[in-house]
């Protein structure tokens, strides 16, 4: 009845688990909201209480910890399902309290079905491998804490639907999967199935991740400006539309921010009075190298605009480059009746 610090529904932690598999879910309070851990809270006499709201219901209800074979149990700050059922889907709340203190947070738990090829609505983590690197490994994720170190599970790896056996450059090594000299054909979904015994029962953990082979840092170069270049001159008459594309190639670099921008007479377009618009498009190669194009457009260019300096700039973690566009005013073709006649001495 007393006030409780309610952190609301933590949708950032959209937890998805597979049906008919064990799941261990830590109370998010200690990981993301409170400055102390469960042991400290427990020592201080605080109690952790769990309850839930079923999918499409409003009613909060206690979790039944008296199910056959302890299907749902709590251990310290962890809620255990051994295993999950489809109708365990809902919003779960963990509340830490005593007579003077109360804090709680809710989080959504979705129990997901998978088919025989491990396809499911599960959001998959992406692991990037560098093309042509010698040896790179992925590790079966999120299996810590399910079984003690004395238990030796069996691990089977799959690519898509196929068990990985005698794959030329993909080698299962227990919890790890090694890739030798990765190629783009190694792109795909990889699944590890971990099987372990517990109290006379056998449990399976299924973990799928997406492997994406990307450009290698050894091949990375500073940004390359393909346009503007020295071969193209933007020759316009006043009143015409001026369109200058700035096209830049960026090597893939992990966590690099790629930037392209124009300056006009050394200033950003926003900082000058002329009516200029800039449209950007981005495309990616199969190894996630990036090509950015920014088209600078002046609808009705003036003779003053044609005297300005238009410079395309690009920056990545590999360096910064710039290139000026060649812009000039078109010399109008002579009108015979006036210019040429005058030239011939006509009056």
């Amino acid at each position: 009845s007393e006030r409780c610090d309610d952190w609301g529904l933590d949708t950032m932690r959209q937890i998805q688990v597979f049906e008919d598999e064990p799941a261990r879910i830590k109370c998010p309070l200690f990981e993301h909201f409170l400055k102390f851990n469960y042991s400290t809270a427990h020592s201080a006499g605080l109690t952790l209480i769990w309850y839930w709201t079923r999918q499409d219901r409003d009613l909060e209800e206690p979790i039944n910890f008296r199910l056959p074979e302890n299907r749902i149990s709590k251990e310290k700050d962890v809620l255990w399902f051994r295993p999950t059922l489809l109708n365990d889907t809902g919003n779960y709340t963990c509340m830490l309290r005593n007579t003077t203190y109360c804090s709680k947070v809710a989080f959504p738990l979705e129990v997901v079905q998978k088919d025989s090829c491990f396809n499911s609505p599960m959001k998959l983590p992406v692991h990037k491998l560098y093309i042509e690197y010698g040896i790179q490994r992925i590790t079966c994720p999120n299996v810590d804490g399910y079984f003690p170190s004395s238990v030796k599970p069996t691990i089977t790896w799959y690519m898509g639907c196929y068990k990985i056996q005698n794959f030329n450059n993909v080698i299962p090594e227990g919890m790890n999967l090694s890739f030798l000299i990765a190629l783009i054909s190694n792109n795909g979904n990889y699944t590890c199935v971990v099987t372990y015994p517990e109290n006379g029962r056998t449990f399976h953990l299924t973990r799928t991740l997406t492997v994406k082979v990307v450009g290698s840092p050894k091949n990375a170069v500073p940004p390359v400006i393909h346009s503007p270049n020295d071969h193209v001159v933007y020759e316009k008459e006043p009143g015409e539309e001026l369109l200058i594309p700035c096209t830049v190639y960026f090597s893939f670099l992990m966590d690099s921010r790629n930037e392209v921008w124009w300056t006009i007479d050394g200033k950003k377009p926003d900082d000058i009075t002329i009516d200029v618009t800039i449209n950007e498009s981005i495309s990616h190669s199969r190894t996630e190298d990036e090509t950015r194009t920014q088209i600078l457009s002046i609808k009705k260019v003036t003779s003053e605009d044609l005297k300005r300096s238009y410079v395309c700039h690009a920056r990545s973690a590999k360096g910064e480059v710039a290139k000026a566009a060649k812009v000039k005013q078109k010399v109008p073709a002579p009108r015979y009746t006036v210019e040429l006649a005058c030239g011939f001495g006509a009056t």
């Epitope: 093309i131 042509e132 690197y133 010698g134 040896i135 030329n168 450059n169 030798l180 000299i181 190629l183 783009i184 054909s185 050894k218």
Partner: antibody, heavy 118, light 107 residues
Framework: EVQLLESGGGLVQPGGSLRLSCAAS????????MTWVRQAPGKGLEWVSA????????LYADSVKGRFTISRDNSKNTLYLQMNSLRAEDTAVYYC???????????WGQGTLVTVSS | EIVMTQSPATLSVSPGERATLSCRAS??????LAWYQQKPGQAPRLLIY???TRATGIPARFSGSGSGTEFTLTISSLQSEDFAVYYC?????????FGQGTKVEIK
């Protein structure tokens, strides 16, 4: 100019061993994967083995797995192929080649002949 | 292992004529296909990579096309130095595999 020069070929008895070398010049050797390809007399090309630029990743054709070992010394710009338990069917010209995923085997050596015969 | 099949095994062509060589992969190799030329007693030379991109220094009369499983090498007007054996190779999946070769001979 990119150059690859193989050496170490010769006549060897079945069950014997041979070590081929490939000396590279004209490019940054440590930046490229390298490979061995062989060609039996009057036959087509067969990929034998590949090694990553850093020497950590190695791959082999099934026909040589467990018998051949590819290695490299980036400080010496040299690629090696250690061939053990040689068989008559390993008789071939052995070429080393530079590879990149984007451009396949873009430069080749002139080859060295290995003859396995009693 | 991806099997590469070239046809025909031998192609007899007169100098100045067009030659069309085919290569088929047992499964898709995307556009990760190369063509090599080999003359007697010499090492192979890269002609085409990425199914259609000419390697450095290769004359424009050589062109490649195709993607997936069907590929073609075309020599628009055969010169005397073009009579050789041509191999296709996939580098999409390990092991990288070659076709058995097409011999282009003088008719």
């Amino acid at each position: 100019e990119v150059q690859l020069l193989e050496s170490g070929g010769g006549l060897v008895q079945p069950g014997g061993s041979l070590r081929l070398s490939c000396a590279a010049s004209g490019f940054t050797f440590s930046q490229f994967g390298m490979t061995w390809v062989r060609q039996a007399p009057g036959k087509g090309l067969e990929w034998v083995s590949a090694i990553s630029y850093d020497g950590e990743g190695t791959l082999y054709a099934d026909s040589v797995k467990g018998r051949f070992t590819i290695s490299r010394d980036n400080s010496k710009n040299t690629l090696y192929l250690q061939m053990n338990s040689l068989r008559a069917e390993d008789t071939a010209v052995y070429y080393c080649a530079r590879f990149r995923y984007y451009t396949a085997f873009d430069y080749w050596g002139q080859g060295t002949l290995v003859t396995v015969s009693s | 292992e991806i099997v590469m099949t070239q046809s025909p095994a031998t192609l007899s062509v007169s100098p100045g004529e067009r030659a069309t060589l085919s290569c088929r992969a047992s499964q898709s190799v995307s556009s990760n296909l190369a063509w090599y030329q080999q003359k007697p007693g010499q090492a192979p030379r890269l002609l085409i990579y990425g199914a259609s991109t000419r390697a450095t220094g290769i004359p424009a009369r050589f062109s490649g096309s195709g993607s997936g499983t069907e590929f073609t090498l075309t020599i628009s007007s055969l010169q005397s130095e073009d009579f050789a054996v041509y191999y296709c190779q996939q580098y999409n999946n390990w092991p990288w595999t070659f076709g058995q070769g097409t011999k282009v001979e003088i008719k």
